[in-house]
């Protein structure tokens, strides 16, 4: 059994999150992950889900009935989802860092975004002019 | 010329968003983009910038003065990134719109927070016996 | 002040083994990865093991796979590395080295070092 | 496996800059934090740059180390060179497997 099964039993607990009337309303995130077969798409998903669990953690760092149990499942996460690769969690943590009332921060995003925009489709890897010939008519065929 | 290029052109004198000193201190997303050439490991990036600009338009919603401009900056992003597949846009809007400080919500992500890890890595593809003796294979020989 | 000190080095004949340790003091032990660097004479650095901070993740470098074992005792802030089967090709210093960053439970740079300690496998 | 390759040796004179690059053989060499180590003479190795550029406490300003994503190398750059440079330097990072490799290190001298 992987490490994280016996501390998300013990989070259960400690939020009540095994009583019955907690499946009521459907799910958060499954059934969106459900919907999701591609990788790429998968990807964009659980970053969500990932940003919402350590923000979860976060709020409740300091309870010691718990630090081991969400330190462990962090872990985890680190391991499956970052592949235990710190840049890459260290990048994604910055990005989930940003405040977005920050007039600083506003102005560098709205600064970097045509160039943020320019990388967002997996065709952004095409020659440029090739690329906005395609955009202009996928976008006259919609 | 992609449409959204003007718009943001208007959306940077709003935001005095081409002055010099906007530059200082280095980027928020683009030295991050750089740093990762993998499609999956881009939309785990990805996912988190764009929830941060769909943030920063809601904050701006009722200004009339670039309405415009958000509106076709954020229906270039849905052809872009969500690949004009507003299922795809809605599932992650929702992942975006869960409140973390709400105990209901809270719950709920803890109760399924097994099942979601277990989804994490790609290797949540092969049947769940073989995949669980992969990750203690993993964790026993590294 | 973060001190290493390992001890265990000498010489052993070709097939034989060694344990080597490594004392730690001036640090939380159990919050940091740790891990064994070699050096053959008048060669260049070579990860050979890590483990992570609890002990519960544990990684080898091809070379000494199935040969070698690392582990630790956080009650005694000690790193062992136990060698078996030990072949010409491991002759070297064994240096044990911190995790330059807590929290993490794989090492991704190494400081401090401590002084080494030399392995001659040698008939 | 990548590898890491760096020049053997390089030499320069006193209060000159000296560049030593690290080239990753494969996969991209942001895509995992670069560390650079000085050896010298007797020494065990000491950290100079971690995390591609950040310098440890009582490393001095002269050493600064850089990723050039085009060339798919890491640099370390070595300002105001002194003759206490002298050694031999490693660059090192971590495959995203639970490797971690080094480079085959580049003496520097230092002339004079």
């Known amino acids: 059994q992987d490490p994280y099964v016996k501390e998300a039993e013990n989070l259960k607990k400690y939020f009540n999150a095994g009583d019955p009337d907690v499946a009521d309303n459907g799910t958060l995130f499954l059934d969106i992950l459900r919907n999701w077969k591609e990788e790429s798409d998968r990807k964009i998903m659980q970053s969500q889900i990932v940003s919402f669990y350590f923000k979860l953690f976060k709020n409740f760092k300091d309870d010691q009935r718990i630090q081991k149990s969400v330190e462990t499942i962090k872990e985890d996460i680190n391991v499956k989802f970052f592949n235990s690769n710190k840049k890459k969690r260290d990048d994604f943590e910055k990005l989930t860092n940003y405040s977005v009332t920050d007039s600083n921060v506003q102005r560098k995003a709205v600064h970097e975004l045509i160039q943020v925009m320019a990388e967002l489709s997996p065709a952004a890897k095409i020659g440029k002019r090739k690329r906005s010939q395609m955009f202009r008519g996928r976008r006259a065929s919609q | 010329q992609d449409p959204y290029v003007k718009e943001a052109e208007n959306l940077k004198k709003y935001f005095n968003a081409g002055d010099p000193d906007v530059a200082d201190n280095g980027t928020l997303f683009l030295d991050i983009l750089r740093n990762w050439k993998e499609e999956s490991d881009r939309k785990i990036m990805q996912s988190q910038i764009v929830s941060f600009y769909f943030k920063l338009f809601k904050n701006f919603k009722d200004d009339q003065r670039i309405q415009k401009s958000v509106e076709t900056i954020k229906e270039d992003i849905n052809v872009k990134f969500f690949n004009s597949n507003k299922k795809k846009r809605d599932d992650f809007e929702k992942l975006t719109n869960y409140s973390v400080t709400d105990s209901n919500v809270q719950r709920k992500a803890v109760h399924e927070l097994i099942q979601v890890m277990a989804e994490l890595s790609p290797a949540a593809k092969i049947g769940k016996r073989k995949r669980s003796q992969m990750f203690r294979g993993r964790r026993a020989s590294q | 002040e973060v001190q290493l000190l390992e001890s265990g080095g000498g010489l052993v004949q070709p097939g034989g083994s060694l344990r080597l340790s490594c004392a730690a003091s001036?640090?939380?032990?159990?919050?940091?990865?740790m891990s064994w660097v070699r050096q053959a004479p008048g060669k260049g650095l070579e990860w050979v093991s890590a483990?992570?901070?609890?002990?519960?993740?544990?990684y080898y470098a091809d070379s000494v796979k199935g040969r070698f074992t690392i582990s630790r005792d956080n009650s005694k802030n000690t790193l062992y590395l136990q060698m078996n089967s030990l072949r010409a090709e491991d002759t070297a210093v064994y240096y044990c080295?911190?995790?330059?960053?807590?929290?993490?439970?794989?090492?991704?740079?190494?400081?401090?070092w401590g002084q080494g300690t030399l392995v001659t496998v040698s008939s | 496996n990548f590898m890491l390759t760096q020049p053997h040796s390089v030499s320069e004179s006193p209060g000159k800059t000296v560049t030593i690059s690290c080239t990753r053989s494969?996969?991209?060499?942001?895509?995992?934090?670069v560390q650079w180590y000085q050896q010298r003479p007797g020494s065990s190795p000491t950290t100079v740059i971690y995390?591609?550029?950040?310098?440890p406490s009582g490393v001095p300003d002269r050493f600064s180390g850089s990723i050039d994503s085009s060339s798919n190398s890491a640099s370390l750059t070595i300002s105001g060179l002194k003759t206490e440079d002298e050694a031999d330097y490693y660059c090192q990072s971590y495959d995203g497997s639970n490797r971690w490799m080094f480079g085959g290190g580049t003496k520097l001298t230092v002339l004079g």
């Open positions: 001036g640090f939380t032990f159990s919050s940091y990865a």
């Open positions: 080295a911190k995790d330059g960053s807590s929290g993490w439970y794989v090492p991704h740079w190494f400081d401090p």
């Open positions: 995390e591609d550029n950040q310098r």
């Open positions: 483990i992570s901070g609890s002990g519960g993740s544990t």
């Open positions: 494969s996969g991209s060499i942001a895509s995992n934090y």
